[in-house]
């Protein structure tokens, strides 16, 4: 197991190139956003700690029909070691807080950039 932010990760954390690619994709989403991202869909907020990739996928997988985040969903699915389906929730969600997809993407991006700067990618 690799260490992510001091917590044991449930699976392999993406190496630097994969993490960089995910960051680039999230940057692309935030920069190219014209209308409200994903029609203003709301998703569960997550704890940006251990198991973050699976938790992020569990949140974003409940958004369908949003072409802007399809690649992000694919990437997160590749980083998460277990099968995730729509409607599935883990203890990693802040279940009383829903935020817009646009805010979710910004929060995730900030956290991933921090991890990348700290070299926490392998």
């Amino acid at each position: 197991l690799t260490c992510l932010g001091g917590f044991a990760s449930p699976g392999p954390v993406p190496p630097s190139t994969a993490l960089r690619e995910l960051i680039e994709e999230l940057v692309n989403i935030t920069q190219n956003q014209k209308a409200p991202l994903c029609n203003g869909s709301m998703v569960w907020s997550i704890n940006l700690t251990a198991g973050m990739y699976c938790a992020a996928l569990e949140s974003l997988i409940n958004v369908s029909g949003c072409s802007a985040i399809e690649k992000t969903q694919r990437m997160l699915s590749g980083f998460c070691p277990h099968k995730v389906s729509a409607g599935q929730f883990s203890s990693l969600h802040v279940r009383d807080t829903k935020i817009e997809v646009a805010q979710f993407v910004k929060d995730l991006l900030l956290h991933l950039k921090k991890l990348f700067r700290e070299g926490q990618f392998n």
Epitope: I61, S64, G65, Q73, R74, S77, A86
Partner: antibody
């Protein structure tokens, strides 16, 4: 419950345009992708194109120049228009909804039969 | 465009035996560790029905007699044991990249 229903003209003359409407119920078009798939008599399935919940579209490359897909979210309707019809456009036309990621096609209409003939 | 070639075009399998259908893609349908290949069953006069998604995941309500395997360009749908109700045409479909494409279909007859 999720339902999709196609309505088309049945018979279209060669060189004319085909317009089919897909009316859905049980879900909102803003949140799901709708595909168009056709099947010539006794033959296989051919993917025509789709419209995402957010309005983006993708098309079969061979038909792109004469195909358009649009929708009216408030009326829960998706529209297919195929121009310059030929006899080999004779087929059963289905509208079908994707599931969640990974966006396999989960729900299908019963299809509408279209014959191109003079 | 990704071309999907199914084989055989038709097959006849005895009740209780195993049916194996192959689908070969002209280029990989894998992306970020997943295979974007799905399988459908179509019976005469009916629309298709999703059986397997992401190469090997059984759709809810589909009997465990159906299974899928493979990655990159080579995929297999297996029905074991075959039942009379399985007589149908089976299609593979990829959505790794647009345009999405279907295989030509395999007609399964039960002996």
């Amino acid at each position: 419950q999720v339902q999709l229903k196609e309505s088309g003209p049945g018979l279209v003359a060669p060189s004319q345009s085909l317009s089919i409407t897909c009316t859905v119920s049980g879900f909102s078009l803003t949140g799901y992708n709708i595909n168009w798939v056709r099947q010539p008599p006794g033959k296989g399935l051919e993917w025509l194109g789709l419209i995402w919940g957010d309005g983006n579209t993708a098309f079969n490359s061979a038909l792109k120049s004469r195909l358009s897909i649009s929708k009216d979210n408030s009326k829960s309707q998706v529209f297919l228009k195929l121009n310059s019809l030929q006899t080999d456009d004779t087929a059963r036309y289905y509208c079908a909804r994707d599931g969640y990621y990974p966006y396999a096609i989960k729900y299908w209409g019963q299809g509408t039969s279209v014959t191109v003939s003079s | 465009n990704i071309v999907l070639t199914q084989s055989p075009a038709s097959l006849a399998v005895s009740l209780g035996q195993r049916a194996t259908i192959s689908c070969r893609a002209s280029e990989t349908v894998d992306s970020y560790g997943n295979s974007f290949m799905h399988w459908y069953q179509q019976k005469p006069g009916q629309p298709p029905k999703l059986l397997i998604y992401l190469a090997s995941n059984l759709e809810s309500g589909v009997p465990a007699r159906f299974s899928g395997s493979g990655s990159r360009t080579d995929f297999t749908l297996t029905i074991d044991p075959v039942e009379a109700d399985d007589a149908a045409t089976y299609y593979c479909q990829q959505n790794n990249e647009d345009p999405r494409t279907f295989g030509g279909g395999t007609k399964l007859e039960i002996k």
